[in-house]
Interface confidence: medium
């Protein structure tokens, strides 16, 4: 290795940092600027830094930070745009208007962002005359072809030095949709923001997972039990670049990101096999889909953890062809094993995620390997859903846009090729991309966990139950038509036909109101049952079910929570098929103090700790100090039966009066499970406050200290099964 002097390597307007123990350097520019002409330089064995060369191979004397600019429209059909500039500065706007008779689709005003990309969507002036809609011309692109009938083709190219991503040719298909994906012309130095990539990647992935979802329900001839068929299977191939230009630290982030991906993908109710391949000059298969362990999340993550940066120290080139070819060989072996004509082979969907930091520089064109893969999987218009290739480049300047674009799949309304600024951005994307909440089926226990999600998106099962006027209780959707809540909400014997259940709705921040078709209130509930024993209020059997007058449409804002002891929850927990209710209890309530949550009046998720075993006893004992409600209590268990979970110690939040009936839930494997429902407590933090956001922490000197009791759903199984037997698939006790 060479030793290079740092003299004269500075960049005007920016800074640099050394990588790989001084064998490489990276230029860093402020937001809205990019390093010109390169982002990284390597120290050559001759002791000099690699030359500063532009894209057209001209040599530059000194690196500089240049202002990012966004490409100008080359042509805009059937309308006008203003202002008309050669290119646009960061923060600059361009506005579009249509001529009479044409309607604007897309964004009327677009702004140039600091990454050199326009915000919004391509503006198109369309009169709706064609079989397919006018496909438009993205900013900086030129289109040939102006007929939009079935079978017509349009071609795109980019002006000057812009790079095309997406499809250079699209065909109007019989279904009125253009083949491929919208072409976008971008500056060679542009990159994607994580917050754009995550949903784009997620949408595409959700489509694939939606298609692979095994919860297709078929009625059995005997009885009305619903059987879940495990049909779909997904092979996920993760390809991690380990070439010289990837630093050891970046490789670690590649591994972490891949682990996140694996973790998320296993939280879906699909059968999945994961292959792990690292590559530099040669690929190394760490896990093959032919290995049974590829179906086991722990095994896959462990093989990822064992991936070693030094595995490739003897060959440090970037041979993307060989990496993709090892996927092809794996597919070939699996096809031979299962039989080319069998459904078992033909029904497998395949997703390849390539994480790289640059161009392939050996082994031939990776496109050839992709062609082989498409061929073996018989990918045509009908089987387009069976293969998705995601090409993700990291490090904006030295990634070859053209190559990434060539490798990524082209599907209408989806993107499969991305360039991110750094590995940190990659980590962010993988954290947020798998947003199952977009799925429209009744998959349970899915909440949007991204930072910018609304409260209702985070807990989409949460509902408000109210008589005509004020809100009184909360509840949880446990299917698309049933709500679980507390019996004491109905103790005034109000006619429940006057009641409303407010369910989350993406179209309205106020939600959507549903009438109640029937209320099933536990017959064992009687708040005055023990009055003659000096127990003024008793909340045993404080459970009720409400059947809504209509089915709730599943969305990001409305979705059931998983109820333990059901097949649905078993799938979400990724437990084997013979699991029992006892197994669920042992897995979910497995510690002396189990972190859990409930939802506050203002919609936020608050934290509690459910006390189990010995700790349950000391948690409940405090009730004996409550002399107002229980003036002469001798045995705490007369009040706190084993039907109750106990919380309220340490820094726990206490539920307010109006939060009764709401779910007490835990998170496991990115899914949410209801283990209890809010019933009663010794302290109301909202007392004396009309403000939903105001909770008064119990004064530290309060006697007795706060305690909260929640109906334990594991103790209410017979009743739940009696009323929900036709709705949910219960496991044996």
């Amino acid at each position: 290795a060479g030793s290079c002097s740092l003299e004269g390597v500075e960049i005007k307007g920016g800074s640099f940092r050394l990588l790989q123990e001084g064998q490489a350097l990276e230029y860093v520019c402020p937001s809205g600027f990019y390093p010109y002409p390169v982002q990284t330089r390597t120290c050559r064995s001759t002791g000099s830094w690699s030359t500063l060369k532009t894209q057209d191979q001209k040599t530059v004397r000194k690196a500089e930070c240049r202002a990012v600019r966004c490409p100008a429209p080359v042509s805009f059909e059937n309308g006008i745009y203003t202002p008309r500039l050669g290119s646009y500065p960061v923060g600059g706007n361009v506005s579009f208007e249509c001529e009479d008779g044409f309607i604007l689709r897309g964004s009327p005003v677009r702004q140039c962002r600091p990454n050199g990309m326009w915000d919004g969507e391509t503006a198109v002036c369309d009169n709706g005359a064609g079989h397919c809609p006018n496909p438009g011309i993205s900013l900086g692109a030129v289109r040939t072809g102006f007929r939009f009938g079935h079978g017509d083709k349009v071609r795109y190219r980019c002006s000057s030095n812009l790079v095309l991503t997406g499809s250079s040719e699209r065909e109007c298909q019989g279904n009125g949709v253009w083949s491929g994906t919208e072409p976008i012309c971008r500056q060679p130095y542009s990159y994607d923001f994580p917050e754009d990539v995550a949903p784009a990647l997620g949408t595409s992935f959700s489509h694939m997972l939606g298609a692979t979802n095994p919860t297709q329900k078929t009625k059995e001839s005997l009885g009305r039990k619903i059987q879940i068929q495990r049909s779909g299977h997904l092979n996920l191939y993760l390809l991690l670049d380990c070439s010289q230009s990837v630093s050891e630290n970046d490789f670690l982030i590649f591994k972490e990101s891949a682990s996140l991906m694996v973790d998320r993908i296993f939280s879906f109710e699909i059968n999945v096999s994961v292959a792990i391949i690292t590559f530099a000059s040669e690929p190394k298969v760490l896990m093959s889909v032919l290995n049974d362990n590829s179906r086991d999340m722990t095994e896959v993550i462990s093989s990822l953890e064992n991936a070693n940066y030094k595995d490739h120290e003897n060959g440090t080139g970037t041979n993307t062809y060989a990496a993709l070819n090892s996927v092809y060989l794996m597919m070939n072996n699996q096809m031979r094993l299962l039989g080319m004509e069998t459904m078992a082979w033909q029904e497998i969907r395949h997703a390849i995620i390539l994480l790289t930091d640059g161009k392939s520089n050996m082994g031939g064109s990776p496109k050839t390997a992709v062609d082989h893969i498409r061929e073996i999987l018989n990918i045509n218009q009908k089987r387009n859903d069976y293969l998705d290739i995601y090409a993700i480049g990291v490090g904006k300047l030295d990634v070859d846009w053209r190559e990434l674009n060539e490798l990524g799949s082209k599907k209408d309304g989806e993107r499969h090729a991305f360039i991110l600024q750094d590995t940190k951005a990659l980590h962010q994307v993988f954290e947020h991309m798998l947003d199952v909440s977009k799925l429209t089926d009744t998959i349970c226990g899915v909440g949007n966990m991204s930072a910018n999600a609304s409260d209702q998106e985070r807990t989409p099962w949460h509902v408000t139950i109210k008589p005509k006027s004020q809100e009184t209780c909360r509840g949880a959707l446990i299917s698309d038509q049933w709500v679980l809540t507390a019996a004491h909400c109905f103790r005034d014997g109000n006619d429940h036909s006057l009641w409303r259940v407010n369910v989350g709705d993406p179209k309205s921040q106020w939600g959507k109101e549903f009438l109640i078709e029937k209320a099933v209130i536990s017959p064992g509930f009687d708040v005055f049952a023990k009055k003659n024993q000096g127990i003024l209020e008793f909340y045993g059997d404080d459970i009720a079910l409400l059947k809504l007058a209509q089915k709730v449409k599943m969305s990001t804002h409305a979705r059931p929570i998983c109820l333990p002891c059901t097949m649905e929850a078993n799938l979400a927990l990724r437990r084997p098929q013979g699991s029992t209710c006892r197994d669920h209890e042992n897995e979910l309530l497995n510690k002396q103090s189990v972190p859990a949550h409930f939802v506050a009046l203002n919609g936020s998720k608050l934290n509690i700790n459910l006390k189990m075993g010995v700790e349950w006893t000391s948690c409940a004992e405090v009730v004996s100090q409550e002399k107002t409600m229980f003036p002469n209590l001798t045995d705490v268990r007369e009040v706190v039966t084993d039907q109750f979970l106990c919380s309220g110690t340490q820094e726990d939040e206490s539920p307010c009066k109006g939060e009764s009936g709401g779910a007490v839930f835990l998170e496991r494997r990115f899914r949410f499970f209801q283990v209890g429902l809010v019933s009663w407590g010794l302290y109301n933090p909202c007392l004396g406050s009309a403000d939903k956001n105001s909770r008064k922490r119990a004064p530290r000197s309060k006697v007795p200290p706060p305690r909260d009791f929640h109906i334990n759903l594991f103790r209410m199984q017979p009743w739940l099964r009696q009323h929900l037997g036709d709705v949910l698939n219960f496991l044996p006790l």
């Epitope: 936020s604 820094e651 105001s694 909770r695 004064p699 530290r700 000197s701």
Partner: antibody, heavy 118, light 111 residues
Framework: EVQLVQSGAEVKKPGASVKVSCKAS????????MDWVRQATGQGLEWIGD????????GYNQKFKGRATMTVNKSISTAYMELSSLRSEDTAVYYC???????????WGQGTLVTVSS | DNVLTQSPDSLAVSLGERATISCRAS??????????MHWYQQKPGQPPKLLIY???NLKSGVPDRFSGSGSGTDFTLTISSLQAEDAATYYC?????????FGQGTKLEIK
């Protein structure tokens, strides 16, 4: 409206005790903690302790533990703070203050000046 | 005990100008999603008056030129456009746990 009315000024000899009262009106007395705060002339505010009128349970600043005693008479909605073994440095204005839903002191009495002098 | 340190000890600001007072806690006053830090104004011969509760919430009846910000250990009281009646001593106070403590106070004068 919420009102806290304190007893009048007191002059005490070192070693004696003083008992300051605070009569509350305009709200349910047992719903909120009552705190006691003192302020020596030209000095800052110093928290003495609080009492939960419902359970008559107390929390004290360690500095006053053993010397300060807080009590309530629920029937007349009045809180009391007694400070014993008075010294000259206990000369101060003593305030009662009612906590609100956020554990802040939303309402204050007018203050009682206690002078300790031989 | 959680020690609250206000800065500056005193300041003089012209009418109509912005006044800013800081309060730093020796340990975090945040719990269960809220910052248990409050601000009071005290004029000579009067009891203190609550201005801001839970770090940033304006008590009803207090003019909106007063605002509070901060989280964890660092908090600020701002008076956006100083009026003559704002000359007073300002105290921060926490109620995160016992014992509650006050800052030493900041005397604000009109320049």
């Amino acid at each position: 409206e919420v009102q806290l009315v304190q007893s009048g000024a007191e002059v005490k000899k070192p070693g004696a005790s003083v008992k300051v009262s605070c009569k509350a009106s305009g709200y349910t007395f047992t719903d909120y903690n009552m705190d006691w705060v003192r302020q020596a002339t030209g000095q800052g505010l110093e928290w003495i302790g609080d009492i939960n009128p419902n359970y008559e349970s107390t929390g004290y600043n360690q500095k006053f533990k053993g010397r300060a005693t807080m009590t309530v008479n629920k029937s007349i909605s009045t809180a009391y703070m007694e400070l014993s073994s008075l010294r000259s440095e206990d000369t101060a204005v003593y305030y009662c203050a009612r906590e609100d839903d956020h554990d802040a002191f939303a309402y204050w009495g007018q203050g009682t000046l206690v002078t300790v002098s031989s | 005990d959680n020690v609250l340190t206000q800065s500056p000890d005193s300041l003089a600001v012209s009418l109509g100008e912005r006044a800013t007072i800081s309060c730093r806690a020796s340990k975090s006053v945040r719990t269960s999603g809220y910052n248990y830090m409050h601000w009071y104004q005290q004029k000579p011969g009067q009891p203190p008056k609550l201005l801001i509760y839970l770090a940033s919430n304006l008590k009803s009846g207090v003019p909106d030129r007063f605002s509070g910000s901060g989280s964890g250990t660092d908090f600020t009281l701002t008076i956006s456009s100083l009026q003559a009646e704002d000359a007073a001593t300002y105290y921060c106070q926490h109620s995160r746990e016992l014992p509650y403590t006050f800052g030493q106070g900041t005397k604000l004068e009109i320049k």
